[in-house]
């Protein structure tokens, strides 16, 4: 939800002023605390799955 | 609306500890990066610490790392600072705000402030 | 990031010029200038160095790159008269300046 336009980095990137570029934010789960990972929003819940055929 | 509502400021000995806490509405909290600023009297504006959406990814100012620690609860609309072994410089009207963080960097969102003081 | 000059004394209608200026060259999309008056809360003016946030009156204005980033008033108005702080996102760290007063002259 952040305001539309503003983020050239596709769903699940972020941008890295330090670097100057998009990074993957799950590149964060090993360096959490690199610059873009600010920018990386918590993943949206994972869609329901029946639990039968 | 989008709103910050802050609780948790008061007075404390030097050597507590405090937490604040800062109630989120009005928006998708898990879809914006939090920080806390502080302000201390008379002075101007210090960046204390951030979170990313997740929470996975928290950040410090020099001067209160190890001590301070920012969290929050995302199913609950919350964010919180922890302050342990505080000192009278951390003395300071203490924001919460909502972080504009995916390549334009901004606090486009303020809470209330709520007043800290370390005193014996 | 220092902010010059500490403080401006003019007088409405005037142009205020304020100067925010970085040890290093910093990513424009970073930089951030705000307002605050006297027992308010901080309101975010600009961001990305020159985009006006939502409901920010078009006689603020900010520009630059590099090292040196500027905010200007064109034209003054009394409630324009205020403390104004830029601030910069890297190195995994946000940092204000010290700030700008405004004040009527």
């Known amino acids: 939800e952040q305001a539309p336009g503003t983020a050239p980095c596709s769903r699940g990137s972020s941008w890295s002023a330090d670097l100057d570029k998009c990074m993957d934010c799950a590149s964060c789960r090993a360096r959490p605390h690199s610059d873009f990972c600010l920018g990386c929003a918590a993943a949206p819940p994972a869609p329901f799955r029946l639990l039968w055929p | 609306q989008v709103q910050l509502v802050q609780s948790g400021g008061g007075l404390v000995k030097p050597g507590g500890s405090l937490r604040l806490s800062c109630a989120a509405s009005g928006f998708t909290f898990t879809s914006y990066a939090m920080s806390w600023v502080r302000q201390a009297p008379g002075k101007g504006l210090e960046w204390v610490s951030a979170?990313?959406?997740?929470?996975?990814?928290?950040y410090y100012a020099d001067s209160v790392k190890g001590r301070f620690t920012i969290s929050r609860d995302n199913p609950k609309n919350t964010l919180y600072l922890q302050m342990n072994s505080l000192r009278a410089e951390d003395t300071a009207v203490y924001y919460c705000a909502r972080v504009r963080a995916n390549y334009y960097y901004g606090m486009d969102v303020w809470g209330q402030g709520t007043l800290v003081t370390v005193s014996s | 990031l220092t902010q010059s000059p500490g403080t401006l004394s003019l007088s409405p209608g005037e142009r205020a010029t304020l100067s925010c200026r970085a040890s290093q060259s910093v990513s424009s999309s970073t930089l951030a200038w705000y307002q605050q008056k006297p027992g308010q809360t901080p309101r975010l003016l600009i961001y990305g160095a020159s985009s006006r946030a939502t409901g920010i009156p078009d006689r603020f204005s900010g520009s630059g790159s590099g090292a040196d980033f500027t905010l200007t008033i064109s034209r003054l108005e009394p409630e324009d008269f205020a403390v104004y702080y830029c601030q910069q996102y890297g190195s995994s760290r946000l940092t204000f300046g010290g700030g700008t007063k405004v004040e009527i002259k």
């Open positions: 979170i990313s959406g997740s929470g996975g990814s928290t």
